[in-house]
């Protein structure tokens, strides 16, 4: 395996709670700044599997606002602009990392948490179960 | 904004870096458990805007492995199984939080970082620019 030497300038880890509790710098570095991603802001309307975005707000979590996608239809929009129920609109899910205040209401103490979010929808061919 | 009363049992915040540096409990709590068990999907193959998944690994980041979606086609798959270039396959992107070791190779000091990931693809009607 790749052996990583320990940096001699590392913070002290004598804390009795180490390694469960560590220091995290919240000055967020944004790796996306120089890239120019195509704006996906109107895909939710232009998609053949359009979705609505629901605001999920939790002041005890960072980020406190997460937008959840909910597919508008069971089927997909066809070329005529009608819903085709021979196809299915399904949510694309992703597990993400968030910080939760712990104990609650503490401004500088958090716990890592994984949550599952729906990011958008895609149109798929349905799985047809044939009854013998 | 929502005012949150400060919990009297909160850790001390006298650190000169506060509130930039906070304590984080790394024993990850999984909010998805039981309420929302994960169900495997092959949407990436069954979608009208199918995608491939590329493994992005960085041992200095948590999560170390992130799977990036890349749309297989510029167009979308039609009912005949052919690519229809009158429609566009586009990536659905999401900004996620990751933890990065800082300084590098330190086991107990991290910085939050935002990165943009492509989670999957969706089929959209193209924006047609008419030349006068």
């Amino acid at each position: 395996g790749i052996t990583i030497p320990r940096n001699p300038g590392c913070p002290n880890s004598e804390d009795k709670n180490f390694p469960r509790t560590v220091m995290v710098n919240l000055n967020i570095h944004n790796r996306n700044t120089n890239t120019n991603p195509k704006r996906s802001s109107d895909y939710y309307n232009r998609s053949t599997s359009p979705w609505n975005l629901h605001r999920n707000e939790d002041p005890e979590r960072y980020p406190s606002v997460i937008w959840e996608a909910k597919c508008r239809h069971l089927g997909c929009i066809n070329a005529d602009g009608n819903v085709d129920y021979h196809m299915n609109s399904v949510p694309i899910q992703q597990e993400i990392l968030v910080l939760r205040r712990e104990p609650p209401h503490c401004p500088n103490s958090f716990r890592l948490e994984k949550i599952l979010v729906s990011v958008g929808c895609t149109c798929v061919t349905p799985i047809v179960h044939h009854v013998a | 904004g929502i005012t949150i009363p400060r919990n009297p049992g909160c850790p001390n915040s006298e650190d000169k870096n506060f509130p930039r540096t906070v304590m984080v409990n790394l024993n990850i709590h999984n909010r998805n458990t039981n309420t929302n068990p994960k169900r495997s999907s092959d949407y990436y193959n069954r979608s009208t805007s199918p995608w491939n998944l590329h493994r992005n690994e960085d041992p200095e980041r948590y999560p170390s492995v992130i799977w990036e979606a890349k749309c297989r086609h510029l167009g979308c798959i039609n009912a005949d199984g052919n690519v229809d270039y009158h429609m566009n396959s586009v990536p659905i992107q999401q900004e996620i939080l990751v933890l990065r070791r800082e300084p590098p190779h330190c086991p107990n000091s991290f910085r939050l970082e935002k990165i943009l990931v492509s989670v999957g693809c969706t089929c959209v009607t193209p924006i047609v620019h008419h030349v006068a």
Partner: antibody
């Protein structure tokens, strides 16, 4: 290809402690987790606990809480499992296994144990 | 904790025969069920992950299906080398648990 090589067989007396090592090679050690699973003679598999090697966070089965300690040393790419207060019921083969530790995205995710060590036989007898 | 119950406990099968092992979870675990094969005096080996995803290097005769609480491991055309004990394992919630195992031997 990931390989996990465990330390050799141990014979212990009741009340003693045990520390088994699991040396990983191949892949990046901090990118995955290590779990410990044991198997008593003629019995099934039992999950004891695991560690997220990236930052040393641990999870333990309630049954072993307070008796088991799992650690990892990134510099040597080795995980350890220490079990104290041994009794004859702890006689078993102890396995370490890799937990891919990937975030769920519909198809790839964590907690299927895809590579296993060869096992360490532990006998507890007075 | 989530209890996994496998059936049967034991199966004696002739080569080329089809083998079906079931695993029932005490609550909904979605697709978070994995199957392992353990041969005598060997470490377990991952066969199927996430209920139905095959693992590289595993023969195509092994397949998995199911979701929720009921899962099946199928060996289509058993071979002599397939003798061993098969375990299911859930990773939905801690503590991770295994089924009691199904021993398959060759007639």
């Amino acid at each position: 290809e990931v390989q996990l090589v465990q330390s050799g067989a141990e014979v212990k007396k009741p009340g003693e402690s045990l520390k088994i090592s699991c040396k990983a090679s191949g892949g990046s050690f901090s990118s995955y987790g290590i779990v410990w699973v044991r198997q008593a003679p003629g019995q099934g598999l039992e999950w004891m606990g695991g560690i997220t090697t990236f930052f040393g966070a641990t999870d333990y089965a309630q049954k072993f809480q307070g008796r088991v300690t799992i650690t990892a040393d990134e510099s040597t790419t080795t995980a350890y499992m220490e079990l104290s207060g041994l009794t004859s019921d702890d006689t078993a083969v102890y396995y370490c296994a890799r937990d891919p530790n990937e975030f769920w995205n519909g198809y790839y995710a964590t907690h299927d144990f895809d590579y296993w060590g060869q096992g360490t036989t532990v006998t507890v007898s007075s | 904790e989530i209890v996994l119950t496998q059936s049967p406990d034991f199966q004696s099968v002739t080569p080329k025969e089809k083998v079906t092992i079931t695993c029932r979870a005490s609550q909904d675990i979605g697709s978070e069920l994995h199957w392992y094969q353990q041969k005598p005096d060997q470490s377990p080996k991952l066969l199927i992950k996430y209920a139905s995803s095959s693992t590289s290097g595993v023969p195509s005769r092994f397949s998995g299906s199911g979701s929720g609480t009921d899962f099946t491991l199928t060996i289509n055309g058993l071979e002599a080398e397939d003798a061993g004990t098969y375990y299911c394992h859930q990773s939905t919630s801690l503590p991770y648990t295994f089924g009691q195992g199904t021993k398959v031997d060759i007639k």
